[in-house]
């Protein structure tokens, strides 16, 4: 399987909410012994290997934000902790998973990574990630709502498998 990032850049004004999205592509094993660990984290734009560094989002680590379930089941993060930080990650039946960030500020700008790990018999088998940039803008020239820029088809499918 692969992860697609429908949008490579999200440009939002301060105070707005945004939902960053990744999509699981390709055949997904739905066996009983297969589960998917999905999560989000921030990373550095300066890294040679995109998404290799895992930093918290609003002080919540990738462990705090993870979803753990089978195949294309729906799931949400544990509400209170994430919501206290204005965050919610979710996953639907179609392989889409997302993180919603509320009341954005300039300090939320940066590179965000989604990570999917396929786990078989309690062992990590396959991991893929996707990256996207969030740019929160201030001042009179900032957009009134979030504007999204599609990934090139090459980018959106070219996700590194480890």
């Amino acid at each position: 399987f692969k992860v697609a990032t429908p949008y490579s850049l999200y440009v939002c004004p301060e105070g707005q909410n945004v939902t960053l999205t990744c999509r699981l592509l390709g055949p997904v094993d739905k066996g009983h012994d297969v589960t998917f660990y999905k999560t989000w984290y921030r990373s550095s734009r300066g890294e040679v290997q995109t998404c290799s560094e895992r930093r918290p989002i609003r002080n919540l680590t990738f462990q705090d934000l993870h979803l753990h379930h089978g195949g294309h089941q729906a799931a949400n993060t544990s509400h209170d902790l994430a919501q206290r930080h204005g965050l919610e990650s979710a996953s639907d039946h179609h392989g889409n998973f997302s993180i919603t960030m509320r009341n954005l500020t300039l300090l939320d700008s940066g590179l965000y990574c989604c990570l999917v790990v396929e786990i078989r018999h309690h062992h990590s088998e396959h991991r893929v990630h996707g990256a996207m940039e969030l740019q929160v803008q201030t001042g009179k020239d900032a957009p009134s709502n979030c504007v999204v820029y599609p990934s090139s088809s090459q980018d959106s499918e070219n996700i590194t498998a480890a």
Partner: antibody, heavy 120, light 111 residues
Framework: QVQLVQSGAEVKKPGASVKVSCKAS????????LHWVRQAPGQGLEWMGY????????DYNQKFKDRVTMTRDTSTSTVYMELSSLRSEDTAVYYC?????????????WGQGTLVTVSS | DIVMTQTPLSLSVTPGQPASISCRAS??????????MQWYLQKPGQPPQLLIY???NVESGVPDRFSGSGSGTDFTLKISRVEAEDVGVYYC?????????FGQGTKLEIK
């Protein structure tokens, strides 16, 4: 290594404009926001504004908003700060500085500074 | 705008002795547990150089005699043993909100 190299000193008359350049090297130019900070002789540091090179977005300190314009040229990895309607109190050293906007939001690399003297 | 107030404005220290500079913000510079407060040193005739970021993290290449502490509105820069090369003006700066603002500066000289 990361370097920000600024243009040379300028002497301008009141009412004129000045355009200072800042050439970046040693990193991916479009990945980091560039800020401008000025320092009048013997005074402290004053933030002027920033430009985001990949989207061209700018935001300026209200104090300068009608007089300052920040632009960029990605082909040469250079940002520019133009200040118009100069007055004597604009005499200062002007610095460009890179913002580490990944997590820390600190100005981690600075240009050497450009002295702008406004005098009749 | 967030107003940054530094104390003292000047400091004269004997080499080998400690030094401490305080900075108070007019409102909290914290965002989800991280304080967006920096410290810079400007040596004579040079641009400022980053010493400490997010209140307590020492920038790479900065001697470990420098340390930062504090959260919310009150911050401190400490030099455990002042050396001759530490002379210059120290500035605190917040990046919690634009416009970014700096303290007035603290001039450190050697006795």
């Amino acid at each position: 290594q990361v370097q920000l190299v600024q243009s040379g000193a300028e002497v301008k008359k009141p009412g004129a404009s000045v355009k200072v350049s800042c050439k970046a090297s040693g990193y991916t130019f479009t990945s980091y926001w560039l800020h401008w900070v000025r320092q009048a002789p013997g005074q402290g540091l004053e933030w002027m504004g920033y430009i985001i090179p990949n989207t061209l977005h700018t935001d300026y300190n209200q104090k300068f908003k009608d007089r300052v314009t920040m632009t960029r040229d990605t082909s040469t990895s250079t940002v520019y700060m133009e200040l118009s309607s100069l007055r004597s109190e604009d005499t200062a050293v002007y610095y460009c500085a890179r913002l580490d906007g990944d997590y820390d939001y600190a100005l981690d690399y600075w240009g050497q500074g450009t002295l702008v003297t406004v005098s009749s | 705008d967030i107003v940054m107030t530094q104390t003292p404005l000047s400091l004269s220290v004997t080499p080998g002795q400690p030094a401490s500079i305080s900075c108070r913000a007019s409102e909290s510079v914290e965002y989800y547990g991280t304080s967006f407060m920096q410290w810079y040193l400007q040596k004579p005739g040079q641009p400022p150089q980053l010493l400490i970021y997010t209140a307590s993290n020492v920038e790479s290449g900065v001697p470990d005699r420098f340390s930062g502490s504090g959260s919310g509105t009150d911050f401190t820069l400490k030099i455990s043993r002042v050396e001759a090369e530490d002379v210059g003006v120290y500035y605190c700066q917040q990046s919690r909100k634009v416009p970014y603002t700096f303290g007035q500066g603290t001039k450190l000289e050697i006795k």
